[in-house]
């Protein structure tokens, strides 16, 4: 990697990309934007999918964490020949389909959608796009929109989770590179560490969850700390404090020495979870220690 900013969050990332006729001479810039961004999401638990839309939606690459498959997916993305209309809702349908199937497996991984389009959506197409984006949200997704050139920011603010989830690129496609840092910062939700990472068996503790993006939730009241104990039972706790770079959470009482709790965070009241490799373990603490 080039040493630029990276994201260590474990979630499902969907790129929904406009390949309508109006982007014909700018596909390289779109591809390069996605490629740069894809390489910066580096958690082994992060899965990625590439979806393109014009008059119809196509899933170019289904969700995968396999870096070789992602490399092949990027190769296919580079070969896309744009053409057709801007049926953005067809792209969201393809994302919702995958989220639906992933949710059916029981454990629900958080989903982040980054949708890129140029141009304004005609009234009926805007209606369908907003509706399909809402369906993705109902399934637990966080939706970001990147608008390039002649986009309608008001439309995109309704398709995305909020105005703050829209990335306007007013200077044309060549300016896409300039928003990689900000889109990475905003769309990345990651758990980096827990303090303390070792707690006393049988005692109650508070834990500081260090990371990024915890205030990116549509509603910070819906943020939860989640502890997956010994790979089986999951306990959700409401944090005492939610800041962008940390959460203050009550830790569950783990009765026995050697118990492990894997740390997760939900941005939507437990509908789905961001995973991490951060583990809290218990140890024996003698009286007075």
């Amino acid at each position: 990697e080039d040493g630029g900013p990276a994201c260590y969050g474990g979630f499902d990332l969907y790129f929904i990309l406009d390949k309508s006729g109006s982007v014909l001479h700018h596909w390289n810039e779109i591809y390069y934007f996605v490629e740069q961004l894809a390489h910066r999401f580096i958690s082994p638990q992060l899965r990625m999918s590439f979806i393109v839309f014009s008059t119809r939606g196509t899933t170019l690459m289904k969700l995968t964490e396999d870096r070789e498959q992602i490399r092949q997916g990027l190769e296919e993305l580079q070969k896309v020949l744009p053409g057709g209309d801007t049926y953005m809702h067809e792209g969201f349908e393809r994302a919702s389909e995958q989220i639906y199937y992933e949710n059916s497996q029981g454990y629900r991984t958080a989903s982040v959608i980054i949708a890129l389009t140029d141009g304004e959506l005609h009234e009926d197409l805007f209606f369908y796009s907003e509706r399909e984006a809402n369906r993705s949200r109902d399934l637990g997704a966080i939706v970001y929109c990147v608008g390039v050139k002649d986009f309608n920011e008001t439309q995109l603010a309704r398709i995305a989770d909020s105005k703050d989830h829209v990335f306007p690129v007013n200077d044309g496609f060549q300016a896409l590179q300039g928003i990689i840092h900000s889109i990475l910062k905003k769309s990345c939700i990651e758990i980096l560490a827990a303090e303390p990472s070792t707690i006393c068996a049988g005692e109650s503790f508070q834990v500081v969850v260090r990371g990024n993006g915890f205030r990116h939730a549509r509603n910070v009241d819906r943020v939860l700390c989640s502890f997956k104990i010994n790979d089986s039972v999951t306990l959700n706790e409401k944090p005492f404090a939610v800041e962008d770079t940390y959460l203050l959470c009550p830790a569950p009482i783990l009765k026995e020495v050697g118990m492990k709790a894997a740390l997760q965070v939900s941005m939507n009241d437990g509908l789905s979870f961001i995973s991490s490799s951060v583990i809290i373990t218990t140890t024996h603490c003698s009286d007075g220690s």
């Epitope: 899933t59 067809e90 389909e97 639906y100 199937y101």
Partner: antibody, heavy 118, light 109 residues
Framework: QVQLKESGPALVKPTQTLTLTCTFS??????????VSWIRQPPGKALEWLAH???????YYSTSLKTRLTISKDTSKNQVVLTMTNMDPVDTATYYC??????????WGQGTLVTVSS | DIELTQPPSVSVAPGQTARISCSGD??????VHWYQQKPGQAPVLVIY???KRPSGIPERFSGSNSGNTATLTISGTQAEDEADYYC???????????FGGGTKLTVLG
Amino acid sequence: QVQLKESGPALVKPTQTLTLTCTFSGFSLSTSGMGVSWIRQPPGKALEWLAHINLDDDKYYSTSLKTRLTISKDTSKNQVVLTMTNMDPVDTATYYCARGGYGDMDVWGQGTLVTVSS
Amino acid sequence: DIELTQPPSVSVAPGQTARISCSGDNIRSMFVHWYQQKPGQAPVLVIYADNKRPSGIPERFSGSNSGNTATLTISGTQAEDEADYYCSSYDYNAHLVVFGGGTKLTVLG
């Protein structure tokens, strides 16, 4: 647990309209992505999808039969109704309703055999 | 509309691996589902979304999807697996569900 049950006439005359009701329990159509499909199977032949309805009352129909089919739902009664006009002996089949999302149908009714004959 | 093509029949010896194919144009960009149907019974979903197994379905059933072919694999095939198998997928462009023509699996012996 999730259950679906088809009901309707076992015998209809040619040119008549068939009305089939699917009564379901154990799930709600208010889940995003969830819906109910109708599928039929003529004796000794393959499955043929007919129609689908979902939470938002979106209705989708088989291309070859769309002029003859109407699907509707009554969420309060947990029922989905299929009507098929201008019945013909070739429409003789077992008609199934099934719960489904995006093309997958994870629970099926037992099916009801409809014979079209004068 | 998309078309899904299956072989009419497949035979396998007990304990061997049975593979049933389902081909269609660019099928790998779609999700394929597989149903088992025994005589006089309603179909049962055995694989959905290419490779996911519903609860209660034995582990010997698995699925894959690449290129223009999706495959249902039954490893260590048992006599009770003898049935008709149908693949299906959702055609987004026409908003309809398409079934393959079905494959009759015969377990020899």
